[in-house]
């Protein structure tokens, strides 16, 4: 009689998470009598997966009826596979005894589990940054297997190249995680921009997963300030306007100062949005010229999104005859750009990022 062989025909089997895995095993002889057991791993720490003789194995079903006459098929089916089921499975023949004695093992079948990555989660910087600055976005996805995975970044549909990606762990594992950090240079036009993290994996059948983040959460566009005087009214009142333009987010507080004293404070709310996502706001102040003997120094002070205040000052010339006054006298400090503003006294210099 030929010696018993335990044959596991497949060296490896790959199964999608949630599906069933069939692990094949046949014996070449009915002799000797004794049960089959399936183990994951080898050595003293091996895990019993199924025993024909005894035990409760709710997820494991023998492929062939164990009571079938002449049965030499000891294949099993494991249901509802998860990444934790990955490993090498051994079909082991025992000889009947008290207790049964291990006789021969199959060569083993490695079960790998194809698990889909979780939906990518994109997170942006904790604090806002201004145009021309670089911010980092992080994309994370977890629980996938096998390890091979492709991650791409896009900004408004254009692929980005400045990013770094890590897949963990480096060694063998039941499942893996990916983390990628992309560096994005902001522009003033990015309020409506979006970054997309795209993950492609064998389990996704060519339909990648995407995570998105809006740059509106990461950007601050500081306002332009312009203070102008309208024509003197017949009642000796001057209408001075402060135009605050192209700012984002909307959170903004404007304070009028007359000769350094607070005249009025306003909070921006429910402003219409510009096409580029920024906001404009105009505030005006009526100054009664006849109530002043000296020139009146008006300051429009804007505090945007919790940043240090930006001042723009304007002097209303009381000494000049109202009728002769120009309709659009400019503010004293006109040498400003979108980031740097000086008040008249050059007391403060504010640089905004």
């Amino acid at each position: 009689e030929e010696e018993l062989q335990v044959i596991q025909p497949e060296k490896s089997v790959s199964v999608a998470a949630g599906e069933s895995a069939t692990l094949n095993c046949t014996a070449t002889s009915l002799i000797p009598v004794g049960p089959i057991q399936w183990f994951r791993g080898v050595g003293p720490g091996r895990e019993l997966i199924y025993s024909q003789k005894e035990g409760h194995f709710p997820r494991v079903t023998p492929v062939s009826d164990p009571t079938k006459r002449n049965n030499m098929d000891f294949s099993i089916r494991i249901s509802n596979i998860t990444p934790a089921d990955a490993g090498t499975y051994y079909c082991v023949k025992f000889r009947k005894g008290s207790p049964d004695v291990e006789l021969k093992s199959g060569a083993g079948t490695e079960l790998s589990v194809r698990a889909k990555p979780s939906a990518p989660v994109v997170s942006g910087p904790a604090v806002r940054a201004t145009a021309e600055h670089t911010v980092s976005f992080t994309c994370e996805s977890h629980g996938f297997s096998p390890r091979d995975i492709t991650l791409k970044w896009f900004k408004n549909g254009n692929e980005l190249s400045d990013f770094q990606t890590n897949v963990d762990p480096a060694g063998k594992s039941v499942s893996y995680s990916i983390r990628s950090t992309a560096r994005v240079v902001l522009t003033r036009r990015d309020v409506h921009s979006q970054v997309i993290c795209e993950v492609a994996h064998v389990t996704l059948q060519g339909d990648p997963l995407r995570g998105t983040a809006n740059l509106s959460e990461a950007i601050r566009v500081p306002p332009f300030l312009e203070v102008t005087q309208q024509s003197m009214r017949a009642d000796n009142q001057v209408n001075v306007t402060c135009q605050v333009t192209k700012f984002y987010p909307q959170r903004l507080q404007l304070t009028w100062l007359e000769n350094g004293n607070v005249s009025r404070t306003e909070m921006a709310s429910a402003l219409p949005e510009n096409k580029d996502g920024t906001y404009n706001w105009t505030s005006w102040l009526l100054v009664n010229v006849s109530a002043h003997r000296d020139d009146v120094k008006l300051t429009c002070q804007v505090e945007h999104d919790g940043q240090p205040a930006v001042n723009k000052s304007f002097s209303v010339k009381v000494s000049a005859h109202p009728k002769e006054q120009g309709s659009n006298t400019a503010a004293e400090n006109t040498g400003t750009n979108e980031r740097d503003y000086k008040d008249d006294d050059d007391k403060h210099h504010h640089h905004h990022h």
Partner: antibody
Framework: QVQLVQSGAEVKKPGASVKVSCKAS????????INWVRQAPGQGLEWIAM????????HYNQIFKDRATLTTDTSTSTAYMELRSLRSDDTAVYYC????????????WGRGTLVTVSS | DIVLTQSPDSLAVSLGERATINCRAS??????????IFWYQQKPGQPPKLLIY???NRDSGVPDRFSGSGSGTDFTLTISSLQAEDVAVYYC????????FGQGTKLEIK
């Protein structure tokens, strides 16, 4: 360790029925056939029938086909053999035996239940 | 049905001597490359005990003085050196079809 524990001795009158139980332990009850064999005093072994507890498939010796019924209760891992219309020549020790190799053989035996049929 | 006939019905052998029991089937019990014959030993007041399965394979814990041989229709159980504890009735059983037993052979010490 495989164990088959049988019910106690019975005394029955001719024409009556007897139901012998066999409680299994030490193995997965539904994975192995249970056989029933009897032995009249001073006589040889006589196979009665076998049952697969997983699906209650049965095979009977033609001699007992009309009088014997095998059943199992998988919740208690117990096999039963009922014999009806008893006659005096049914007096015997009734054994249950487990087939460990699915070879239609008897690897592990209960200790037997003596059924005496007497008027 | 297959009928099994054992011979002799009884046998007396001296301690240490060889004992041979035969079992003949009314038709071949070979199938699928196996000979479907089993041998049991039954001592007084005890249930039978499996000795040999598939004609020639000793069950676990069975001393190696017991051996089985044969094929087709003729089979033999041999005890190479009889021990006092071997006194018993020996039965052959076939399972090529549904199980049937031989009538038994009583083995005693001479």
């Amino acid at each position: 360790q495989v164990q088959l524990v049988q019910s106690g001795a019975e005394v029955k009158k001719p024409g009556a029925s007897v139901k012998v139980s066999c409680k299994a332990s030490g193995y997965t009850f539904t994975n192995y056939w249970i056989n029933w064999v009897r032995q009249a005093p001073g006589q040889g072994l006589e196979w009665i029938a076998m049952i697969d507890p997983s699906d209650s498939e049965t095979h009977y010796n033609q001699i007992f086909k009309d009088r014997a019924t095998l059943t199992t209760d998988t919740s208690t891992s117990t096999a039963y053999m009922e014999l009806r219309s008893l006659r005096s020549d049914d007096t015997a020790v009734y054994y249950c035996a487990m087939d460990y190799g699915s070879l239609y053989a008897m690897d592990y035996w209960g200790r037997g239940t003596l059924v005496t049929v007497s008027s | 049905d297959i009928v099994l006939t054992q011979s002799p019905d009884s046998l007396a052998v001296s301690l240490g001597e060889r004992a041979t029991i035969n079992c003949r089937a009314s038709k071949s019990v070979s199938s699928s490359g196996y000979n479907w014959i089993f041998w049991y030993q039954q001592k007084p007041g005890q249930p039978p005990k499996l000795l040999i399965y598939l004609a020639s394979n000793r069950d676990s814990g069975v001393p190696d003085r017991f051996s089985g041989s044969g094929s087709g229709t003729d089979f033999t159980l041999t005890i190479s050196s009889l021990q006092a504890e071997d006194v018993a009735v020996y039965y052959c059983q076939e399972s090529r079809e549904l199980p049937t037993f031989g009538q038994g052979t009583k083995l005693e010490i001479k």
